[in-house]
Amino acid sequence: MNGRVDYLVTEEEINLTRGPSGLGFNIVGGTDQQYVSNDSGIYVSRIKENGAAALDGRLQEGDKILSVNGQDLKNLLHQDAVDLFRNAGYAVSLRVQHRLQVQNGPIGHRGEGDPSGIPIFMVLVPVFALTMVAAWAFMRYRQQL
């Protein structure tokens, strides 16, 4: 049985203190520039080396930021969200959603040396080949009618 990639979503409150160069990360998203399809949320796109966020270590690229100092980031233009961060105080409280990729395999014990799942291309290539063969056979059959 093949492994299946799922996501474990967890939330965390991260309190950051502005360093000499600020909070030290970039964001994407907003109602005017959706980063994720059908989601106007705000996501971390880059964490700057040696910035406050990098030194704290909890905020990760790809994390979704739900609120800043208790203020919801839903339905904000990108620039309004940026403003909210820039004009926040010295101590900034972030409510963050992490998406952890987890491998869901068959029920039962998986040995330490076992692979954690089959790469997707190893499944797709045979499926694609079979589809092509079936299509070819169907076309030949139609020609004979």
């Epitope: 030290g24 796109s45 940026v82």
Partner: nanobody
Framework: QVQLVESGGGLVQAGGSLRLSCQAS????????MAWFRQAPGKEREFVAA????????YYADSVKGRFTISRDNAKNTVYLQMNNLKPEDTAVYYC??????????????WGQGTQVTVS
């Protein structure tokens, strides 16, 4: 590189007024958001006011609402902070900050050296 130069600070009596100016120079500056922050002795730097265009937005800290007014002259790349009804607790070094208009950083990109405001 962008340089920010503040001016207009000084000593003023409580209830008085001051007008701070901050001029941005440097070929890379593109009329992005600009702001004023302040830092009182022994305290952390705090946000005072910010202004941006496209779309136009103006923000104030609760402690200065109704007393301070931020404005800008895009042709001169200058932002102003008109401070009225000053109080002793407004005493601080006032810093100007600016960001490039397309920056996605959650921090201001440039900072001035600061100008001292003392309210007696």
């Amino acid at each position: 590189q962008v340089q920010l130069v503040e001016s207009g600070g000084g000593l003023v009596q409580a209830g008085g007024s001051l007008r701070l100016s901050c001029q941005a120079s440097g070929r890379t500056f593109d009329s992005g958001p600009m702001a004023w922050f302040r830092q009182a002795p022994g305290k952390e730097r705090e946000f005072v006011a910010a202004i941006r265009r496209s779309p136009e937005r103006i923000y104030y800290a609760d402690s200065v609402k109704g007393r301070f007014t931020i404005s800008r002259d895009n042709a001169k790349n200058t932002v102003y902070l008109q401070m009225n009804n000053l109080k002793p607790e407004d005493t601080a070094v006032y810093y100007c900050a600016a960001a490039l208009s397309r920056s996605t950083s959650v921090d201001y990109d440039y900072w001035g050296q600061g100008t001292q405001v003392t309210v007696s």
